[in-house]
């Protein structure tokens, strides 16, 4: 029968760790960590790395109990927690009977928005104390609310991920500019900043109708040049507040109608957190 | 029936290359490891190298890591070996080997003995 | 690398006779050992994998033993076709490398 993994959670040091090995099996020949999406019962889906290893090609791999992965987070606060992989089977070939190396994968680690985490392994068992054993480690940093995978979490459409406010911007003339976007449910406060290199005018908009998608207007005095100026808008929401995804625009020539024009250049960026 | 072949012999120059083939059938190509080994006048056996056929990934002794090239074409079930810049020192019969489960060498070409000459 | 010491360098035997070769590596190798029989002119031929294993179509004559760094063939009841070259073989993690050989021949 070929080899399989069974994992489970390993906080500690491994018993191994404290015996003493005359021969250890070497190190991983490949690391690799991707982001894979899993449903959850409320509805949303949860992200979790897929982390896959390749063993090396010879003999000393018929050593092999186990691999540990270990993984730390950095965000906000520190994460840290460790998987043992125990291999079902002793090696009896040193490629699969297929051909290729043998590959193993755990699913499990779950993954927060916008983290970098250290992702490390190695075999058991491993060197002994005082030694350095053959070890492998990887980074992978998870993407935020504008991911395309990750913007359909609730997390992230509370935080507007999903929303569109379509801004059309028009210098109206040397004093003013009109902004219009459309507004969202998700929340009743924005605040619309004019830069061209600096701030040259900036407003804020409170929208008391919440409930339902409107088209906001507002007319911003402006101390400068705007044309081809950007303009950010901000919103405030209740789980991000003032650190939701913000929207950019560029300021063009009202028409003669005062109507401004639509743009199709509009962007997104996230402020300083994403959620 | 497992079978490694390989051309009888080689006649080259010194400071030219020869590149050498073992066609292989009777069992799955990617699934093994192939080696090569040289064998000189009178002497014992030394390992190349290997090649996975699978993903082409290679190991060298130190030794000929500049002296030996080691390629595979999977479509026609065949490893090749190239060695640079021959001298003298070359002179040898070079066999390939295709490992067991592990690195024992299960099956050996008949070899082929390149001769270094002016 | 792990250097593999052959002895004896060669043999000068009868037929019927009883011969062991020995083999040391100059570390632990886990018996990850092979012996290869070479006729003269010929590529080498599996003989024994493993320390052990006999490969397919090896009489029983030939046995394998050994652990750790030491290694021995023996050859009960010594045939003629058994003359040739012989060497030992480690294959624990690359570079492998061979022992230099015990020339096996009739007395």
């Known amino acids: 029968r070929e080899p399989t993994v069974q994992c489970g959670s390993e906080t500690g040091p491994s018993p191994e760790w404290m015996l003493q090995h005359d021969l250890i099996p070497g190190d991983l020949r490949d690391l690799r960590v991707e982001p894979v999406t899993t449903s959850v019962a409320t509805g949303d889906y949860s992200i979790l790395m897929n982390v896959s290893w390749v063993l090396r090609a010879d003999a000393s791999i018929r050593l092999l109990k186990a691999t540990k992965i270990c993984v730390t987070g950095k965000s906000n606060f520190q994460s840290y927690s460790c998987v043992r992989c125990n291999y079902t089977e002793a090696f009896q070939t040193q490629t699969r009977p297929s051909g290729g190396k043998w590959t193993f994968s755990y699913i499990g680690f779950p993954v927060e928005l916008n983290t970098v985490y250290f992702i490390g392994a190695h075999n058991i068992p491993n060197a002994n104390m005082n030694e350095d054993g053959p070890s492998m480690s990887v980074n992978f940093t998870s993407p935020g609310c504008l991911d395309h995978i990750m913007k359909y979490k609730k997390k992230c459409v509370k935080a507007g991920s999903l929303w569109d406010p379509n801004i059309t911007a028009c210098k109206k003339n040397e004093e003013t500019v009109e902004v219009n976007f459309t507004t969202t449910p998700l929340g009743n406060r924005y605040m619309a900043l004019i830069q061209h290199s600096t701030i040259i005018g900036f407003s804020q908009v409170f929208e008391p109708h919440q409930k339902k998608q409107t088209r906001a207007s507002v007319v911003i005095p402006v101390t400068g040049d705007s044309e081809g100026a950007t303009v950010q808008l901000t919103p405030y929401f209740p789980t991000c507040g003032s650190d939701c995804i913000r929207h950019k625009g560029t300021v063009v020539l009202c028409p003669q109608t005062g109507v401004p024009f639509p743009l199709d250049n509009n962007k997104s960026k996230p402020g300083g957190w994403l959620p | 029936q497992v079978q490694l072949q390989q051309p009888g012999a080689e006649l080259v120059r010194p400071g030219a290359s020869v590149k050498l083939s073992c066609k292989t059938s009777g069992y799955t190509f990617i699934s093994y490891w192939m080696n090569w080994v040289k064998q000189g006048p009178e002497q014992g056996l030394e390992w190349i190298g290997r090649?996975?056929?699978?993903?082409?990934?290679?190991q060298y002794n130190q030794k000929f890591k500049d002296k030996a090239i080691l390629t595979v074409d999977k479509s026609s079930s065949a490893a090749y070996m190239q060695l640079i810049s021959l001298t003298s020192e070359d002179s040898a019969v070079y066999y390939c080997?295709?490992?067991?489960?592990?690195?024992?060498?299960?099956?050996w070409g008949q070899g082929t003995l390149v001769t270094v000459s002016a | 690398d792990i250097q593999m010491t052959q002895s004896p360098a060669s043999l000068s035997v009868s037929v019927g006779e009883t011969v062991t070769i020995t083999c040391r590596a100059s570390?632990?190798?886990?018996?990850?050992l092979a012996w290869y029989q070479q006729k003269k002119g010929k590529s080498p031929q599996l003989l024994v994998y493993?320390?052990?294993n006999l490969a397919d179509g090896v009489p029983s004559r030939f046995s394998g033993s050994g652990s750790g760094t030491q290694y021995s063939l023996k050859i009960n009841s010594l045939q003629s076709e058994d003359f040739g070259s012989y060497y030992c073989q480690h294959f624990w993690r690359p570079p492998y490398t061979f022992g230099g050989g015990t020339n096996l021949e009739i007395k």
């Open positions: 090649i996975d056929p699978y993903d082409s990934e290679i």
């Open positions: 080997a295709r490992s067991g489960g592990f690195d024992w060498f299960a099956y």
């Open positions: 493993d320390v052990t």
């Open positions: 570390e632990n190798i886990n018996s990850n």
